[in-house]
């Protein structure tokens, strides 16, 4: 028991990458617990993370039902044990999150260069099509499945020994670039959604250089 009053959550923040979506908030609870609710603008409030002492809640299962919807979450604070509540007239304390539209706002995860193959003066570079937690017909969709032509990849490449970088873009997950025969090149990729106003670009993929185990070389 105690006399510490229940306090409302604050700093509600969405953390989302490739649709894996977690709501975070403060403060760390003292003599209180939280329950989270999530809703679309036109939908009903669905409770998640019941009576938790965590300050985060994984809402992925809810948002992947329709990633183009706009979601709102709220965090309720309830007294733990025999602690007084500050809610007026028995109303629970809660705080609303900012709105969140997964399709427009989820961060693009760091891409991975899956393979590269050199044939003469051409190199075919393939970026891995990452699996998301979005489902259709009981199978998980890839990033390309979800975003379609909205998603492009940019490849940055350069001669191993030089500093001058070139770029190439693709609406698929493959690049075909011109190289000089017998010269080693390095490259990295970046996922981009040009139509976005926020979170347009992913972080850079790890750099891969020709001559490493991911590559194939044919005359």
């Amino acid at each position: 028991s105690g006399t510490t009053n229940t306090v409302a959550a604050y700093n509600l923040t969405w953390k989302s990458t490739n649709f894996k979506t977690i709501l975070e908030w403060e403060p760390k609870p003292v003599n209180q617990v939280y329950t989270v609710q999530i809703s679309t603008k036109s939908g009903d409030w669905k409770s998640k993370c019941f009576y938790t002492t965590d300050t985060e809640c994984d809402l992925t299962d809810e948002i992947v039902k329709d990633v183009k919807q706009t979601y709102l979450a709220r965090v309720f604070s309830y007294p733990a044990g025999n602690v007084e509540s500050t809610g007026s007239a028995g109303e629970p304390l809660y705080e609303n999150s900012p709105e969140f539209t997964p399709y427009l706002e989820t961060n693009l995860g760091q891409p991975t260069i899956q393979s590269f193959e050199q044939v003469g003066t051409k190199v075919n570079v393939t970026v891995e099509d990452e699996r998301t937690l979005v489902r259709r017909n009981n199978t998980f969709l890839s990033l390309r499945d979800v975003f379609g032509k909205d998603l492009i990849y940019t490849l940055y490449y350069w001669k191993d020994s030089s500093t001058g970088r070139k770029t190439n873009t693709t609406h698929t997950n493959e690049f075909l670039i011109d190289v000089e025969k017998g010269v080693s090149y390095c490259f990295f990729a970046q996922a981009v959604i040009p139509s976005r106003t926020v979170n347009r670009k992913s972080t850079d993929s790890p750099v891969e250089c020709m001559g490493q185990e991911k590559g194939e070389f044919r005359e």
């Epitope: 009903d44 019941f50 009576y51 002492t53 309830y78 044990g81």
Partner: antibody, heavy 121, light 107 residues
Framework: QVQLVQSGAEVKKPGASVKVSCKAS????????MHWVRQAPGQGLEWMGI????????VYAQKFQGRVTMTRDTSTSTVYMELSSLRSEDTAVYYC??????????????WGQGTMVTVSS | DIQMTQSPSSLSASVGDRVTITCQAS??????LNWYQQKPGKAPKLLIY???NLETGVPSRFSGSRSGTDFTFTISSLQPEDIATYYC?????????FGGGTKVEIK
């Protein structure tokens, strides 16, 4: 098998306290919430509160706030519900009930056999 | 608190009949609703969780559905062993609350 075994019937005087125990077996005690639900004779079910056996955190229905205390002993996989300042209207069968898995977190999938508490002068 | 209004409070039906019980929530509770069966002198037993999911081991004659704030529990073909009181329970809002119960008897 998974089961919850509760302590025996109690008869108490008004103003006294009662402490009911509920011993869990057949599953990992810390992984599931435990609830207490009561049922007055011939009446419906009433939720009293919840305890998280992992950290001992409790949340009570406002109606019982200040009168109920739920505790747990992880060494014996037992939860306890103590109700103080008893009055005649507290005469009821008291059940412990396990909260389900993450899929159905607040569905009571396993119940104790119930403990009859009679408050009479 | 969320009020769960269950109806009817009692009903009498013949073996083989289709039995329907409804539960209305005083506000939107999404699909956060469970159904229990309680036989005389026994603890309740979970039958349906999240409005329409059948608990493991429960016969398929039991089912649940939702339409807005109205929830329906159905026994497709009443059996003698189904004589009991049935309760709905919401968990979308604190505190968790139960309906008043429906007593099912055989004609």
């Amino acid at each position: 098998q998974v089961q919850l075994v509760q302590s025996g019937a109690e008869v108490k005087k008004p103003g006294a306290s009662v402490k009911v125990s509920c011993k869990a077996s057949g599953y990992t005690f810390a992984n599931y919430y435990m609830h207490w639900v009561r049922q007055a004779p011939g009446q419906g079910l009433e939720w009293m509160g919840i305890i998280n056996p992992s950290g001992g955190i409790t949340v009570y229905a406002q109606k019982f706030q200040g009168r109920v205390t739920m505790t747990r002993d992880t060494s014996t996989s037992t939860v306890y519900m103590e109700l103080s300042s008893l009055r005649s209207e507290d005469t009821a069968v008291y059940y412990c009930a396990r909260g389900g898995s993450k899929v159905a977190a607040l569905a009571f999938d396993i119940w104790g056999q119930g403990t009859m508490v009679t408050v009479s002068s | 608190d969320i009020q769960m209004t269950q109806s009817p409070s009692s009903l009498s039906a013949s073996v083989g009949d289709r039995v329907t019980i409804t539960c209305q929530a005083s506000q939107d509770i999404s699909n956060s609703l469970n159904w229990y069966q309680q036989k005389p002198g026994k603890a309740p037993k979970l039958l349906i969780y999240d409005a329409s999911n059948l608990e493991t081991g429960v016969p398929s004659r039991f089912s649940g559905s939702r339409s807005g704030t109205d929830f329906t529990f159905t026994i497709s073909s009443l059996q003698p062993e189904d004589i009991a009181t049935y309760y709905c329970q919401q968990y979308n809002f604190h505190p968790l609350t139960f309906g008043g119960g429906t007593k099912v008897e055989i004609k």
